[in-house]
């Protein structure tokens, strides 16, 4: 993927979806009532003419916005500490990992507009992610259906960067 | 292609115990419960209980708690439905179906074709 | 726990009839209703979910619609095919409960 996005970013994706699972605090059956339509963007990580800058752009913001919303006050009151804090080190070297790798795609001259499009609408769906904790105050199931819906979208999101390694492993063989 | 399928007919006698399957694939096995629905002869559908197979977590109907035990190895993407000593009232067609958990979804969108269990002296 | 309770247990109706069958919950369950077709010898299959959405695949003649505690499954222009049992089911809370079932005959 040119920086490559290393088997280890793909790792620590999946690090991060076991620390996600690890996190549950109550039994998501009594939660049923609460799910809600969070509306996440499918087609931004179902399509197959996948760019390098749209991946990696997908995946910074998905990756920024989880560590917003597991890092705060709030946030810090619902969830064992110890799994939150290694939750917000592995987003963290993500993030520096995935900043790398977006100035060299923006310095081999993709277009902006495939980094800027996917972020705009990735944080509309999750300010409604935000505005859903709030309506419901912060309860243990609203923090619960959050944490599936999260765990949903990443593994999507991380689905998507492995279609884009694999689809570069098959022209580098061709 | 989402696919559930499930363990073939049993026949069994009273007291005895049995274990039925149903085998998930076309899909994240873990990423969706399995609920068991119990149809008697000529009867209505019951929900007995569902399980989380990522980690075994269970819930079930008041009516099946304490008859049954719903179990799963997400290794082999298979759930279980399990007696340790049948009734002649536990005659029945089993169903399994897959559930979204909290993600909106379609609830119960795939459903196994049935195990039909006879339990008779 | 919540009941479901369907009304008709069992209808007769005639190819391009348009046919009704309610379900009632014994509390609020918000939108949380699903509709199944149930032929016989055949597993049920997921028909209308969310007391509205149409399940893909499903024939557009079948529509669902209510929320809180009555729901409706309209069948606009009844096909032969269409003869089977109907049931409703909540998934609001656990236990998850379905109705008893419509029966849909010819008549």
């Known amino acids: 993927l040119g920086c490559d996005l290393p088997q280890n970013h793909g790792l620590l994706s999946r690090n991060t979806l076991v620390l996600l699972h690890q996190m549950r605090r109550i039994s998501p059956f009594l939660c049923l009532k609460d799910r809600r339509d969070f509306r996440f963007p499918q087609e931004m990580v179902k399509g197959s003419q996948l760019q390098k800058a749209h991946v990696m752009s997908v995946l910074h913001e998905m990756l920024q916005q989880i560590f917003s919303l597991f890092h705060t006050e709030r946030s810090s009151a619902a969830w064992n500490m110890t799994l939150l804090d290694q939750l917000h080190t592995g987003l963290h070297q993500q993030l520096q990992h995935l900043e790398t790798c977006l100035l060299q795609v923006v310095g081999e001259g993709e277009s902006a507009g495939a980094i800027s499009s996917p972020a705009l609408t990735l944080r509309r769906y999750f300010q409604g992610i935000r505005v859903y904790l709030k309506e419901k105050k912060y309860s243990d199931c609203a923090w619960e259906v959050v944490r599936m819906e999260i765990m949903k979208s990443l593994f999507l999101s991380t689905n998507m960067q492995e279609r884009l390694r694999s689809k570069d492993r098959d022209l580098g063989s061709s | 292609e989402v696919q559930l399928v499930q363990s073939g007919a049993e026949v069994k006698k009273p007291g005895e115990s049995l274990k039925i399957s149903c085998k998930g694939s076309?899909?994240?096995?873990?990423?969706?419960?399995i609920g068991w629905v119990r149809q008697m002869p000529g009867k209505g559908l019951e929900w007995m209980g569902i399980i989380d197979p990522s980690d075994s977590d269970t819930a079930y109907s008041p009516s099946f708690q304490g008859q049954v035990t719903i179990s799963a190895d997400k290794s082999i993407s298979t759930a279980y439905l399990q007696w340790s000593s049948l009734k002649a009232s536990d005659t029945a067609m089993y169903y399994c179906?897959?559930?979204?958990?909290?993600?909106?979804?379609?609830?119960?969108?795939?459903w196994g074709q049935g195990t039909l269990v006879t339990v008779s002296s | 726990d919540i009941q479901m309770t369907q009304s008709p247990s069992s209808l007769s109706a005639s190819v391009g009839d348009r046919v009704t069958i309610t379900c009632r919950a014994s509390?609020?369950?918000?939108?949380?209703l699903n509709w199944y077709q149930q032929k016989p010898g055949k597993a049920p299959k997921l028909l209308i979910y969310?007391?509205?959405s149409l399940q893909s695949g499903v024939p557009s003649r079948f529509s669902g619609s209510g929320s809180g505690t009555d729901f409706t499954l309209t069948i606009s222009s009844l096909q032969p095919e269409d003869f089977a049992t109907y049931y409703c089911q909540q998934s609001y809370s656990i236990p998850i409960t379905f109705g008893q079932g419509t029966k849909v005959e010819i008549k």
């Open positions: 076309g899909y994240s096995f873990t990423s969706y419960w």
């Open positions: 179906a897959r559930h979204p958990g909290l993600n909106w979804a379609p609830d119960f969108d795939y």
């Open positions: 969310y007391a509205s």
């Open positions: 509390q609020s369950i918000a939108g949380f």
